[in-house]
Each structure stands twice: as C-alpha cells, then as structure tokens.
Amino acid sequence: EKPVYELQVQKSVTVQEGLCVLVPCSFSYPWRSWYSSPPLYVYWFRDGEIPYYAEVVATNNPDRRVKPETQGRFRLLGDVQKKNCSLSIGDARMEDTGSYFFRVERGRDVKYSYQQNKLNLEVTALIEKPDIHFLEPLESGRPTRLSCSLPGSCEAGPPLTFSWTGNALSPLDPETTRSSELTLTPRPEDHGTNLTCQVKRQGAQVTTERTVQLNVSYAPQNLAISIFFRNGTGTALRILSNGMSVPIQEGQSLFLACTVDSNPPASLSWFREGKALNPSQTSMSGTLELPNIGAREGGEFTCRVQHPLGSQHLSFILSVQRSSSSCICVTEKQQGSWPLLT
C-alpha cells in the first residue's frame, strides 16, 4: 500500500505589505517508531527550488540555512510533533509573492515534499490605515492618552516607527511624538484641528497614516451681546461685561445677538427682568428682536448660557428715553451708560 502523506493548507493567502499573516497548516506522514525515533524536521521552501540545495524560508532544523531575506519573518508556529506546520509571515514584502511548498524529513525513511499542495502568497500594496484610540470626548484641560496601532502588524521584522503631527501637539517635545502613545492636554483652540499618526516600518519604504479631526469639549467662553440698531446706520454695540446701561430712544427697533464660544454648542435663552422671554421673540441662534420699543419695555436683559461644562450669563440695562424731537441726539457717556441713540 502507498505511504500516506497529506497536507492541509489553504491554496492562497493575501497580505498587505508590511503586515502579518498566519497560515494554518497540518500534515500527516507514515511513521512506525518501534525501533528508533529520529528527529522530525519540517521545512518551507520557495517553489521551484530543490530541497537538497536550497536555503529554506522556515524550518525547525537548526542545521539548515535559512534564506537571509526571510530570516525572522517566516516562522513555524505550533508544535510540529503534533503535525502542525502553520506558517507565520511577518513584515510581508512584495518580493515574498510566490508559491511555497512544505517538506517533511524523519530519518532515512521519511523524506517527502508536498508538491501537490502549494501555498500561493500574494503581497499587495498597503492600504490598511492605523487606528487612533482615545476616550471621547476630549475635554479641554484634561490630559488624555492617545494610542496609535496598525491592525494586522505583528512583532516580526523591524519595529514600527510612529510619528504624530498636528497643531494640538505644538508644545510637545519631538521625542514624545515618536511614540505609539502620547498624552495630550487639549485646548479650546484645538477643536476641529487635525491630528495625524504616521506609521513606518524601519528600513522599509512602507508608510501609512490616519488623520482624525479633534472634537474638544470646552466650557462656554467669550460670552458677548451685540446690539444692532435699526436706524439705517448699521451701528452695533458689543457688551462684554455685566451691568452696562444702554440708553435708547423710544420707538427704536433692536436686534440683540448673544454669542458664545463652546463645544458642544451651548443653549442660549433670553430673560427680561428675570423672566424668560416668549420663544417666538427669540431664535435658536440666540437672537432677540425688539421691534418698536415702548417706554415701558426697558429694563435688565439677560442672556443665559447653559452647557454641560458650566453655565454663564451676561446682562445689560436697556434704558428707554421718551422721544422729544426727531433729531438724533448723542449725549456723552456718563457713569457706565452709552450715549443716547435716536
């Protein structure tokens, strides 16, 4: 009867340049070991090579020379005694593309190349991008650990080198930005900026990168109220501090715009004399329209900002002057009030 040599291995495998792949494999061979037990040696060879002369791509035989170009990158994984011939290929290179065959040797009786079951390896261009991991959301002033990793990469071959770039990193020293991990303390101005992690394999021309846009949460800042007068001159006042008095002529029309810088956007609401104004008068953007102001419609106006990271408010006093003539009179600003605008 014919000796039984069998090999289970996939016909083809594809891996991206610079990445790793594990090719599962098992084999069987005829063995009757009642008299001696010589060592079992297994080999992976490039197709078309004569096993007696060729350098191997991977083996468990310490006396056989391994091809320098596959040394350390092609490795037998698993226990060959348990007939496991699985092959790990790391830091794949374009020139690794091709067919490979497996061979078993044990003493003088077992010597066999499994030429019928070749493994076809295809190495394609690297399109895999690194992953950037961090806990979202980023919060202004709170140190956050970011990590960069390349899926499908492994320990085999030269190490990966990392480099981080982005406006948010400007204060960091260059050494910090060459690690796969970095700690970033984001600022409000970093929101919306790009952060890039570039991964390169040392000694190779294989580079890949991923860019993320930073989403930095920060408390409301730069709260301001702008008052637009409907007098045809397009004049605007900007209120930045509480308690300012703004005199205005009766019958005037105003737009009050409350602006604030925050992320996520804060919710804005208007109050007059402590009472919330009718939503129909206000817009989502925090604009309040006061058409044709009457003598009794002045008082303290407050823009209130609500936000998960803190609330703020800004108030001013609208002082309505009765109309005495049709001329535009501008009086000098006194004790924290603005000139009278008509």
């Epitope: 078309g48 096993p51 002369y53 056989r64 003088r108």
Partner: antibody
Framework: QVQLQQSGGGLVKPGTSVKLSCKAS????????IHWVKQRSGQGLEWIGW????????KYNEKFKDKATLTADKSSSTVYMELSRLTSEDSAVYFC????????????WGQGTSVTVSS | LMTQTPLSLPVSLGDQASISCRCS???????????LEWYLQKPGQSPKLLIY???NRFSGVPDRFSGSGSGTDFTLKISRVEAEDLGVYYC?????????FGGGTKLEIK
C-alpha cells in the same frame, strides 16, 4: 530498499540514437534526483546531468547538452536518457545514480548499462 | 577541475593510505555546505559512496575511512588498509555545475 534497475543499450550503429532506462523502486519517485554518469572503458567517471522529478528540474553538463536528453515517466517511476547522433566516443558504460537528502551524495547506483557504437 | 593524487597508490595490508584531491576553485555551495564526496569503485561494479560532505561516513562504511579538508584541498584517509578496500577511489564535487569527478586513484597491493 532503494533500487535502480537499468536497461537499454547494447550494440548500436553510428548516427542513430539509444534510449537508456533507469527504473526506481523502494522509495517515492519524486524524492530522488537521478544522475547519469558516463565511464569509458578503463577511464574515469564523467557526470552527464540530473533529472529531479519533484519539480521536473533538469541540469546538464554543458559538454553533454547536445548529446543527452533526460526525461521521466512518473507512472512507471522511470528516468530515461536518450543519446543522439552516436559516435564511437559515446561507447561507454552509463550509470544512473540516485541522491536525496541534504547530504547531496549519490548514495544509490544502478548496475550500469553498456553502449557500444559500431557499424 | 578536480586533481587527484596519487594516480596509483601501492600499499601493504594494514598500512595507512592517504589520497589527496585538489579543486581549481572553492566548492562551498551557496547554501553553506561543501558537497565533496568520495566513492570507491571495484572492478566490474558500480561506484559506492564512502564519504559525503567532506567528512561524513555513509551508513555501513567502516570507521577506518575518514575525510577531511576545506575550501579547495581535501583528503581521504584509510587507517588500516584491508583487502576489500582495493579499487579505484574518486573524489567528487556536487557544489557547482558541472559536477565533476577527480581522475581517480588506484589503491593496489604493493
């Protein structure tokens, strides 16, 4: 037990061809490299070439490239050497020898077959 | 080119015999091995392998046979010649195509 059984040869006319056989047994045919070696009467040994059935690899000594053609039939585990355009210089004993393993030696030999070229 | 010396070596039984083989170039194969072999051919027989890879005895070969050398110079030694050792000894290199045999050394009784 590995055996290489040779046949063919004998007395042949100049200008003709002869096909020598080397039938292998006792091992897996694809696992051995089969070499052919020439020995003229009272002379030394000359390597002609090899045939490796494992990957159908054939190597020739440049001197015999136009003289010898190596082929094989896997189904009968036989390697053939055809010698063409025979002259008296081709009169010799031809051996086939098998080698396998990393040691690289011709560890099994056929009994040899004699070719005499004469009109 | 493989140059074997001497061409003929007359010995007495029990003597030591030494045969030299010089190669015209290094016969270290690209895989790191040196495929230098020694064969013995007795009259009317096929050659038989004695030594492979410079110094390794083939199975069944008596330990009175030993091989040594490196690069281009190699030696076969027979420590105590016996009657069954008589014949023609050939060195052979299987590192570079064309593979080549030495010219042979005839070991004979003095």
């Amino acid at each position: 037990q590995v055996q290489l059984q040779q046949s063919g040869g004998g007395l042949v006319k100049p200008g003709t061809s002869v096909k020598l056989s080397c039938k292998a047994s006792g091992y897996i045919f694809t696992e051995y490299i089969i070499h052919w070696v020439k020995q003229r009467s009272g002379q030394g040994l000359e390597w002609i070439g090899w045939f490796y059935p494992g990957i159908i690899s054939i190597k020739y000594n440049e001197k015999f490239k136009d003289k010898a053609t190596l082929t094989a039939d896997k189904s009968s585990s036989t390697v053939y050497m055809e010698l063409s355009r025979l002259t008296s210089e081709d009169s010799a004993v031809y051996f086939c020898a098998g080698h396998e393993g990393y040691d690289g030696a011709m560890d099994y030999w056929g009994q040899g077959t004699s070719v005499t070229v004469s009109s | 080119l493989m140059t074997q010396t001497p061409l003929s070596l007359p010995v007495s039984l029990g003597d030591q015999a030494s045969i030299s083989c010089r190669c015209s170039q290094s016969i270290v194969h690209s895989n790191g091995n040196t495929y230098l072999e020694w064969y013995l051919q007795k009259p009317g027989q096929s050659p038989k392998l004695l030594i492979y890879r410079v110094s390794n005895r083939f199975s069944g070969v008596p330990d009175r046979f030993s091989g040594s050398g490196s690069g281009t110079d190699f030696t076969l030694k027979i420590s105590r010649v016996e009657a069954e050792d008589l014949g023609v000894y050939y060195c052979f290199q299987g590192s570079h195509v064309p593979w080549t045999f030495g010219g042979g050394t005839k070991l004979e009784i003095k």
